[in-house]
Each structure stands twice: as structure tokens, then as C-alpha cells.
């Protein structure tokens, strides 16, 4: 058993049928010695008396808010949450496995640039009695500060019969140098509490590996006189790290015909302009990636050819 | 074809091309090593990210773009030393910092060259003959060093009398290749920045 925060305790249980559970001793936070009784949650049933209460915690019915009373007045509370260990592996009931970029990915994180700011998100089908808290640091043995904001419900989607909820959090490394070579990964730890179940999820990454630039901006297409060709140009997104000659991007450009089946001609360039053959009803698209480190491509920015 | 992109003229800055080759070679060698050593802890998540140039060179700080010099988080340490001009500085007014930066890059390459050669010597003794560094990566390091053209004392190649532990050597190779790829990214960024300025 360990203390999560004041008056909230997590009992770690080896979770299998007929498991003996864990013996927990609760102590009433009071100078009083006599006439103390204990109850669980809203039930008025007295579980025991005395300054301490010893309980065997086996399943969720044994978890909850234990209160010690004297003469009808509550003296102190202890909330017991359960953390299930199933055959050596902590349970992951609350969050959905996003399976990207690999199985057992519960937290996904992205950064738009090298400023040390990043966003993480996660999915659940649970809609009520759910709380999250997030901590982050660079490195774990001698951690350097990362400050995270409040967790927000960022999206709701219908997936088949189920509703899926996306939560996200923004974090900022306290002293980040965009040009630094990362040696220690960023650690993100999310505590999830659903009713009386406690779970924790972690992700470890380097900012360089989670970079995903915003799409190129100001995408413009100028037809060339007396030609089927057009001059296209675009700019680095505003959110990308500067100077651009140091934090350079490379671009993938394509012309997509009206039919999705039509062969797409893709080429790569480090420049911010190109000459394309742009037929009517087609569209021109461009996406960006760090020029020197193969992290994610941005989403496409598109403009119609007509 | 529906697309065409004009190709740039020759780089004004002769080191840019070499640094691009360096990054390609570093990335390809790391990728190949990860495939060959698939049963060894060789992924980014599994290895310790060590910087073998730590306390010997100060490339990141010395090569900071001017725009980032105001960022206090970027200025942990600054090293100054006697600088000699290399041919990469050809016919351009260069600040003391730029010379220091290129000197630091040269010294990085020298350190890695020695480490890779020592490692290769060990790996060639492995009866499994599972992996060794091809001449490409050593050749590319050498080309960039020649382009930088600094005169410096040769770093002696480390020799080891004890029987090499090939498992540890291969893990060490992974650590070095990951670190070298990261440094190659920095070098390429720096050369691109200098070429643009």
C-alpha cells in the first residue's frame, strides 16, 4: 500500500480468483483514543471500533472511503483504491491501446517543433467517474523539470456501438534548447482513476522522435502563361523552429487527380516552390518533414488546380 | 511527369555536400546494424544515449545559430581555444565562433574515427564475423575532415590487450552509431546554416 495523495491510498493486488489479498491497517487521524467506530462509504454499518482498523482487501467491494467517527462526527477519511497486477503485469483497463506506432501504445505524443513543448493524448470508452493527473520530467534518475497543464477532454467520437473519448495535455520543458542533442528521454506519467480502480501509464521519448510539423502555409498556385504548367509555392509553418536554415524542412509534393485511383506522382524537394503540370479538377498537395531526422510527415496542405 | 523541381547550383560552402553524405552514411549504417543485431538491445529505447565527445568538444554550443544565443538554456558551456582556419572558411569573413565551431566538428570526427577504427579491429576478430563497419562511413568521415582541413595532432588508436567481449562490443557499436547519427544531424544543420549565411 502506498499514499497517492493526502488520505488517498493505493493497494496493489495480485489479481486472480481466490487470491488472499492484502492486509491493510487503517489508523484514525485523531488524538482521541476511545469510542471510535469505522464505516465504509455511505453504508452506516459499523466495521469495527478502536483507533485502528485491520481489513483484508481482496476485491473492489473492500475498497472505498473508510471513515472513523466519534459520537456521530467524522474524524478522518482514508480512500482506498485498487491497482490490479494480473500475472505480473499491471492492468490497463481504463485506456485504449492505440496500436500506433506499435502495440501497447496507450499514450501518444507529438511536438510541432524543437521548443520543448509537446502534446500527449489518450483514448477511453469510459465517460464518468474518471480522473487523470499527469507528471513529466526529462530523465528519471536525476529528473529535469517539465511543466504540464490541465488535462482536457479534447474530442468525442462514435466508434461502432461505443463512444470514444480523447483526453489531451500540453507540456513544456522548463529549460529547453531547440538545438540541444537529447541524451535523456522525456518521461510522461499519467495516473488514471476510474471509480475505485487506479492505473498508471507511462511513455518515454525524445522530442526529436515525436516531431510532426504543421502543414506548410500560404500554398499558392500561379498558372504559367501559354502552358499547362503552374508555379506552386509555399512557406514554412509559423510553428516551426527558427532559424529555418538550421532547422530545415524537406517537402513531399503531389498532384492528385479527381479520381482517387489515379496514379499520384510524388516528388521530394528541399525548396519552397516547384513547377507542376496541374490539370483541371486535380489538386496540388504538399507536406513537410524535418530535413535531417526522419520523424513524422506533417498533414497535407492542398490547393485546387483550377 | 506532373512535377519538376529545379536543381540548385554548386554549394558556395564546400562542406555542405560532405556533411550531407555524412548523415546519409550514419543513418544507413545504423539502420543496417539494427537489422543485423536484431537480437541485441540496439534500438533507441534500449540503449544508453552516451556522448563520447562530452567534455572534449563543444559542437552544439560553439555552433549555435546567432538567433539562439539569446536562449539561456542553450548556453551551458562555452569553450575557447586557438583556432586555425580550414578550407571550408574559404574567402569569407568568419567570426571567431564560426572557426571554433568548425574546429569542434573536426575534433568530433576525429574522436569518432578513432572509436570506429578501434571497434572495427575488435569486430574483425569475432569468429561469427557478424558485423563490421564498411569503408563508406570511415571514408565519408575522412572526406569531411579533409574538407575542414585543420591541422591537428593525430589521436592514437586505442589498442586493447584483453580478449574482446564481442557481445559488449556490438552493444557499444549500437551506442556509438546512435550517438554519431545525432551528431551528424547537428553537423548537417550547422553546415546548412553556414551555407545560408
Amino acid at each position: 500500500i502506498w499514499e497517492l495523495k493526502k488520505d488517498v491510498y493505493v493497494v496493489e493486488l495480485d489479481w486472480y480468483p481466490d487470491a488472499p489479498g492484502e492486509m491493510v491497517v487503517l489508523t484514525c487521524d485523531t488524538p482521541e483514543e476511545d469510542g471510535i467506530t469505522w464505516t465504509l462509504d455511505q453504508s452506516g454499518e459499523v466495521l469495527g471500533s478502536g483507533k485502528t482498523l485491520t481489513i483484508q482487501v481482496k476485491e473492489f467491494g473492500d475498497a472505498g472511503q473508510y471513515t472513523c467517527h466519534k459520537g456521530g462526527e467524522a474524524l478522518s477519511h482514508s480512500l482506498l483504491l485498487l491497482h490490479k497486477k494480473e500475472d505480473g503485469i499491471w492492468s490497463t483497463d481504463v485506456l485504449k491501446d492505440q496500436k500506433e506506432p506499435k502495440n501497447k501504445t496507450f499514450l501518444r505524443c507529438e511536438a510541432k517543433n524543437y521548443s520543448g513543448r509537446f502534446t500527449c493524448w489518450w483514448l477511453t470508452t469510459i465517460s464518468t467517474d474518471l480522473t487523470f493527473s499527469v507528471k513529466s520530467s526529462r530523465g528519471s534518475s536525476n529528473p529535469q523539470g517539465v511543466t504540464c497543464g490541465a488535462v482536457t477532454l479534447s474530442a468525442e467520437r462514435v466508434r461502432g456501438d461505443n463512444k470514444e473519448y480523447e483526453y489531451s495535455v500540453e507540456c513544456q520543458e522548463d529549460s529547453a534548447c531547440p538545438a540541444a542533442e537529447e541524451r535523456l528521454p522525456i518521461e510522461v506519467m499519467v495516473d488514471a482513476i476510474h471509480k475505485l480502480k487506479y492505473e498508471n501509464y507511462t511513455s518515454s521519448f525524445f522530442i526529436r522522435d515525436i516531431i510532426k510539423p504543421d502543414p506548410p502555409k500560404n500554398l499558392q498556385l500561379k498558372p504559367l502563361k501559354n502552358s499547362r504548367q503552374a508555379e506552386v509555392s509555399w512557406e514554412y509553418p509559423d510553428t516551426w523552429s527558427t532559424p529555418h536554415s538550421y532547422f530545415s524542412l524537406t517537402f513531399c509534393i503531389q498532384v492528385q487527380g479527381k479520381s482517387k485511383r489515379e496514379k499520384k506522382d510524388r516528388i521530394f524537394t528541399d525548396k519552397t516552390s516547384a513547377t507542376v503540370i496541374c490539370r483541371k479538377n486535380a489538386s496540388f498537395s504538399v507536406q513537410a518533414q524535418d530535413r535531417y531526422y526522419s520523424s513524422s510527415w506533417s498533414e497535407w496542405a492542398s490547393v485546387p488546380c483550377s | 511527369r506532373n512535377l519538376s523541381v529545379a536543381t540548385p547550383g554548386p554549394e558556395m560552402f564546400p562542406c555542405l555536400h560532405h556533411s550531407q553524405n555524412l548523415l546519409k552514411a550514419a543513418s544507413n549504417t545504423l539502420q543496417k546494424a539494427r537489422q543485423i543485431l536484431e537480437f541485441y538491445p540496439c534500438t533507441s529505447e534500449e540503449i544508453d544515449h552516451e556522448d563520447i565527445t562530452k567534455d572534449k568538444t563543444s559542437t552544439v554550443e560553439a555552433c549555435l545559430p546567432l538567433e539562439l544565443i539569446k536562449n539561456e538554456s542553450c548556453l551551458n558551456s562555452r569553450e575557447t581555444s586557438v583556432i586555425t582556419k580550414g578550407s571550408c572558411l574559404a574567402s569569407r569573413k568568419t567570426s571567431f565562433m564560426m572557426a571554433l565551431c568548425l574546429r569542434s566538428i573536426y575534433e568530433d570526427l576525429q574522436i569518432y574515427q578513432v572509436e570506429f577504427k578501434t571497434m572495427n579491429a575488435k569486430l574483425l576478430m569475432d569468429p561469427k564475423r557478424q558485423i563490421f563497419l564498411d569503408q563508406n562511413i570511415l571514408g565519408v568521415i575522412d572526406e569531411l575532415m579533409q574538407a575542414l582541413n585543420f591541422n591537428s595532432e593525430t589521436v592514437p588508436q586505442k589498442s586493447s590487450l584483453e580478449e574482446p567481449d564481442f557481445y559488449k562490443t556490438k552493444i557499444r557499436l549500437c551506442i556509438l552509431l546512435h550517438a554519431f547519427r545525432i551528431r551528424a544531424v547537428t553537423i548537417d544543420r550547422v553546415m546548412s546554416y553556414l551555407n545560408a549565411s
Epitope: 489479481w15 486472480y16 481466490d18 503485469i89 470508452t125 | 538491445p41 534500449e46
Partner: antibody, heavy 115, light 112 residues
């Protein structure tokens, strides 16, 4: 004490279907994940499928994916395995078992797929 | 086929010590705990060892388990006639959990 009893096995022709049941007693069935494991005659143990305590997530071995469906009825304390498009290589003793460090196995039910 | 490799058979005289190895990789045994089962002919597997080296109550202390790196082993000391059975190791893969990974199985024969 924990008890698991499989039923529903038998002889079936290739391409046909069969539904296995596993009746659980002696524990809070709705709190625990459950597995199906099979063993072909003279061969080793092979994991088939897993279902979460609340039925929210199901996992399958590649060899049965798309043909077998694991399900549970927590009100009846019963685990099921619906087996469609049966093949000769599905011939085995099928066991249900609890998920956890200390597990409990049923006695098994024999499924023979033969023409 | 199984990704956890065991020797097909081991044998020993009564009273002897035999060991069964179970070889995996970084993503399974290297990252997860190991169980060992005993299966007597015509019966369901019986748990002998969990969490690499822990014995459930009722399992004789002649059975012991250990794990090192990407492999595990089961030792039976003071071999007895009733130990003649098939033995399986079991673990998980960090990317496919909760799928159970079973070893190929080892037939233990008690000589004489």
C-alpha cells in the same frame, strides 16, 4: 473453491460450427479475464483467445482470427467459444482457464473435426 | 509455432537432478515473468512455478524455477517416478500481451 467445467465438444465436419461453453463457479467470475487454450493430440499447448473481465476487449491467435469468437455472459458465469469454418487442424482438447499468476484450468472438452 | 524453445526430452534416474531450459527473446522472457506447468497424461496442466521462481502452495520444494535475461529454467531435484510428465514454460510478449506464449514442451522420463 474455483471450478471450471467445459462442454460442447464433439465430432464435427470441416466447415461446420460448434460452440463451447465454460461454466465457472466458486469465484466472482465478472472480475477476471479468461482464456481458451487448446492441445492437439500428441502436441503442445496453444493459446486460442482471451477476453477481458467485462468483455470489452478480445484477443485471438492468428490461426483462429476471423473464424472463432470468444464471449462471456457474466450474469450466467459462463465463457463461450463460437467456432466457425472448422478445419481438421482445429482438432484438439479445448481448455478454459482464468487469467492471473495463480490460474485454474477446466478438465477440457474434445473437439474432433473430421469428414 | 512456439517462440519459446524447450528441449524435446530430458531423463534422469530416481533421486537425480534434471533441468529444463526455456529460451526466448528480449520482448518475451526478457520483459515478462515465466510460469511452468506440469501435465500428466490425460489431465489439464498444473501450475508448478509462477513469477519465475515462486511455488504455489502444495507444490513440493523439489521443483524450482529461475530466470536470467531471455531464458528461464526449471530444476527438479530428487527425481521421483511421479514426476514423469510433460513440462511447459509460459510467458507473454510485451507487444501481444495478453496472448499466452507456451514453450514447445519437454517430456521428462524417469529411468529404471
Amino acid at each position: 473453491q474455483v471450478q471450471l467445467v467445459e462442454s460442447g465438444g464433439g465430432v464435427v465436419q470441416p466447415g461446420r460450427s460448434l460452440r463451447l461453453s465454460c461454466a465457472a463457479s466458486g469465484f466472482t467470475f465478472s472480475s477476471y479475464g479468461m482464456h481458451w487454450v487448446r492441445q492437439a493430440p500428441g502436441k503442445g499447448l496453444e493459446w486460442v483467445a482471451f477476453i477481458r473481465y467485462d468483455g470489452s476487449n478480445k484477443y485471438y491467435a492468428d490461426s483462429v482470427k476471423g473464424r472463432f469468437t470468444i464471449s462471456r455472459d457474466n450474469s450466467k458465469n459462463t465463457l463461450y467459444l463460437q467456432m466457425n469454418s472448422l478445419r481438421a487442424e482445429d482438432t484438439a482438447v479445448y481448455y478454459c482457464k482464468t487469467h492471473g499468476s495463480h490460474d485454474n484450468w477446466g478438465q477440457g472438452t474434445m473437439v474432433t473435426v473430421s469428414s | 509455432q512456439s517462440v519459446l524453445t524447450q528441449p524435446p526430452s530430458v531423463s534422469g534416474a530416481p533421486g537425480q537432478r534434471v533441468t529444463i531450459s526455456c529460451s526466448g527473446s528480449r520482448s518475451n522472457i526478457g520483459s515478462n515473468t515465466v510460469k511452468w506447468y506440469q501435465q500428466l497424461p490425460g489431465t489439464a496442466p498444473k501450475l508448478l512455478i509462477y513469477y519465475n521462481d515462486q511455488r504455489p502452495s502444495g507444490v513440493p520444494d523439489r521443483f524450482s524455477g529461475s530466470k536470467s535475461g531471455t531464458s528461464a529454467s526449471l530444476a527438479i531435484t530428487g527425481l521421483q517416478a511421479e514426476d514423469e510428465a510433460d513440462y511447459y514454460c509460459q510467458s507473454y510478449d510485451r507487444y501481444t500481451h495478453p496472448a499466452l506464449l507456451f514453450g514447445t514442451g519437454t517430456k521428462v522420463t524417469v529411468l529404471g
